[in-house]
């Protein structure tokens, strides 16, 4: 007996859609083998109509698809715009059509229920609005207009032109009679409920001359859209509920085991703490549509999600909804990267951000998640070099190590830097990831002077002290600009034995500027790295002033000033729409800094990693 299972009988009506789910044991082989849906012919052969390898027969073009959910051992065949010709015997299966891993499915497409002649059929989703059109003759223009609902053999009055409204329809129904000359009245029912389903009768006038029109109202609960996203990745729920609710509070909720719906986020400021730092509700368009982005997907995020509109910001019967069934694929293409990065006050962090390696040319961004109201994520830095003003000199986005990962370095950390940050690109939105920066107790490992004043035309040496644990790392100095941090030409660091027996006298890398020019003013970073992977950095600002006293200047760490206080974000910073991102409404980019000028000239700057402090001063 075949291990594949599905519905033996599927019945539907013309014009409708079916979603046929076939279940299989999720062994490694089964998960990755071909899935198919075929129709059994008179000869006994089964002709493929759609398969997981992308094949769609001409008969199914534009109206059918097959989606595999390997972790759940399920694949789904969706067929839309059914006709009676689709009635027949089918198989859903794995592998080759003629082999035994399949399941027989009978599909019956009927004309629909027998309805009175001339019945108009209205098919509407729950919570939406329907407008029932009711024609009448001229002689019935001045007479009473009414809408009845047929329940069994009786007709129940729903609304009439004498201002009667059935209590079941209170505050959500209206009867409109047009001006003279138009021989049609309409009944508009808002916020449709499942109980509104049924046969209705429009009537104008009474007696034998009355006009009648039948309307069949089918109210459907939306079939959840199946969404299959990678662990650690991102999902976007696009929610379009219609103009009728454009000005009503919106929400996204997740259905729980009690079949109620827990609010995940709404426009009234509510947010589930499980989604802290990794959710945004996009500002809605004029048509009332909005979207919700969730990053850093976890297995426990799986489930049924509903978006909707209601003044309370939560699910209520009879209000429009959209539904999704989210599955999180544990066989993720998104690499593991730390979700929490820790740094100390005054220190630094280097964050690795994954991106789709097929999109190496995409623009890379880093933004700070802000939880207020619906959440927003203003850009702090992007690969084209724009850096937000208050991050000048302490933030850089590097394309390294490349091949699906970029690096963001933030230094001069303060407690205000703690929070959630998003890595993203203007390409594949599913690769948005979240990282939390935590500020912990401790001292920075790299020590540089707080700030330095250099004299024009003279020589400047800036020491950077590192602990023994970094002795095997590559040390570098670079000059920061808003387009990155240009590494300064490094001189031979001398024999490697200098660091083998690491002691107090062999932990110094010095930057020498000789002679100092105006262009040397700016931020310099001392850092350590291993190959293309960056470690800690420390920043020092070099101010350049006119010559006062002749001679060279050496800055000793003992005379170094304290690092300047972090500039705090001005809450009034203007938001600028960022055109580079696919969904520009999701993120706002703050004021950006102009380029800070030329890099220090190559031959004038040198980096010296010496075996003793005394030797650190000279430029070789």
């Amino acid at each position: 007996k075949s291990p594949v299972f599905g519905p033996q009988e599927v019945s539907s009506v013309e014009g409708n859609s079916v979603s046929i789910k076939c279940y299989y044991p999720p062994t490694s082989v089964n998960r990755h083998t071909r899935k198919y849906w075929c129709r059994k012919g008179a000869s006994g052969r089964c002709i493929t109509l759609v398969s997981s390898e992308g094949y769609v027969s001409s008969n199914y073009a534009g109206r059918a698809n097959l989606t595999n959910f390997p972790e759940n051992g399920t694949f789904v065949v969706n067929i839309a715009q059914l006709s009676r010709d689709d009635s027949g015997h089918y198989k859903c299966g794995l592998g080759i059509n003629s082999r035994g891993l399949s399941f027989d499915v009978s599909l019956e497409v009927s004309q629909g229920p027998e309805l009175p002649n001339g019945t108009e059929v209205y098919t509407v989703d729950v919570g939406r609005t329907v407008t029932i059109k009711c024609p009448f003759k001229t002689e019935n223009a001045p007479k009473t207009k009414a809408l009845y609902k047929k329940i069994g053999q009786t007709s129940v009055l729903v609304i009439d032109s004498r201002n009667y409204v059935n209590p079941n329809y209170k505050d959500r129904i209206r009867l409109r009679i047009p001006g003279t000359g138009q021989l049609i009245f309409t009944v508009v029912i808002d916020r449709l409920r499942l109980s509104d389903h049924g046969l209705y009768l429009c009537q104008a006038g009474d007696g034998s001359n009355r006009d009648e029109k039948n309307a069949d109202l089918q109210v459907l609960e939306p079939e959840p859209e199946l969404v299959y996203e990678d662990l650690r990745g991102s999902v976007t729920f696009h929610c379009a509920l219609g103009l009728e609710v454009a000005n009503v509070a919106k929400f996204l909720c997740r259905v729980n085991s009690r079949e109620t719906c827990d609010v995940v986020i709404n426009t009234l400021g509510k947010r589930d703490s499980a989604f802290e730092g990794r959710i945004l509700l996009n500002p809605q368009d004029k048509d009332g549509s909005f979207s919700v982005v969730i990053t850093g997907l976890r297995k426990e995020d799986e489930g049924r999600y509903l978006c909707g509109a209601h003044s309370d910001g939560q699910l209520q019967e009879g209000w429009p909804i959209q539904a999704w069934q989210l599955f999180v694929n544990e066989e993720s293409t998104i690499p593991r990267s730390p979700t929490v990065v820790k740094g100390v006050a005054g220190g630094s962090v280097a964050v690795l951000c994954p991106y789709n390696p097929k999109e190496s040319q995409s623009l890379k961004y880093w933004c700070l998640w802000e939880g207020a109201q619906n959440g927003r994520c203003p850009l702090l830095v992007e690969s084209q070099g724009l850096v937000q003003e208050q991050y000048e000199g302490r933030l850089s986005l590097l394309q390294e190590p490349g091949n699906g990962t970029f690096t963001v370095i933030l230094n001069q950390l303060t407690t205000q830097d703690a929070g959630f940050y998003w890595c993203l690109t203007n390409g594949d939105t599913r690769w948005r990831t979240t990282v939390e920066i935590k500020i912990i107790e401790g001292e920075p490992n790299l020590k540089v002077p707080g700030n330095v004043t250099a004299v024009l035309g003279e020589t400047l040496n800036i020491p950077c002290h590192f602990p023994c644990k970094f002795s095997s790392y590559e040390k570098y100095w670079c000059k920061w600009s808003n387009t990155g941090c240009q590494t300064l030409p490094s001189q031979d660091e001398g024999p490697s034995e200098a660091f083998v027996n690491c002691d107090e006298n062999s932990r110094l890398v010095s930057l020498t500027l000789n002679p100092v020019t105006r262009a040397d003013e700016g931020w310099y970073w001392c850092g350590v790295k291993q190959g293309h992977f960056y470690g800690e950095t420390a920043a020092v600002y070099v101010a350049v002033e006119e010559k006062k006293v002749a001679g060279s200047r050496y800055v000793s760490p003992a005379k170094a000033d304290a690092a300047p206080d972090e500039k705090v974000l001005d809450s009034g910073v203007r938001e600028i729409e960022n055109k580079a991102i696919q969904d520009p409404r999701l993120f706002a980019e703050e004021k950006v800094v102009a380029d800070t000028g030329d890099q220090a000239g190559g031959s004038r700057a040198s980096v010296d990693s010496s075996s003793s402090e005394e030797q650190g001063g000279s430029s070789k």
Partner: nanobody, 126 residues
Framework: QVQLVESGGGLVQAGGSLRLSCAAS????????MGWFRQAPGKEREFVTA??????????YYADSVKGRFTISGDNARNTVDLQMNSLKPEDTAVYYC?????????????????WGQGTLVTVSS
């Protein structure tokens, strides 16, 4: 909260027929799965049949052991589901449970149903 009440159980001769009914009260849904499971004395509960309504279409599932003999039907507007059992065999003897599940997802043979009835006893004598 949804309550499920089964009826129609009883004693029947082998080869005979029986019709079980299940009524759900407490909530209206246009999209959910209702199923029948059974548990014979000393055995584990097993799937018998299920019906799923979704988007105006109906999907019916049967266990191999009852295919061709049992027929499930229902009216989702009235939240009822019936099980017509023909050609009954002594091995069909069991307590039959009605179950409802609100999610349209998941294998209907599984136990992940949200609501269960108290059960009705069907005894098939030889």
């Amino acid at each position: 909260q949804v309550q499920l009440v089964e009826s129609g159980g009883g004693l029947v001769q082998a080869g005979g027929s029986l019709r079980l009914s299940c009524a759900a009260s407490g909530r209206a849904f246009s999209q959910y799965t209702m199923g029948w499971f059974r548990q014979a004395p000393g055995k584990e509960r097993e799937f018998v049949t299920a019906i799923r309504w979704s988007g105006g279409s109906i999907y019916k599932y049967y266990a191999d052991s009852v295919k061709g003999r049992f027929t499930i039907s229902g009216d989702n507007a009235r939240n009822t589901v019936d099980l017509q059992m023909n050609s009954l065999k002594p091995e069909d003897t069991a307590v039959y449970y009605c179950a409802a599940r609100m999610s349209p997802w998941g294998d209907p043979r599984g136990n992940e149903y949200d609501y269960w009835g108290q059960g009705t006893l069907v005894t098939v004598s030889s």
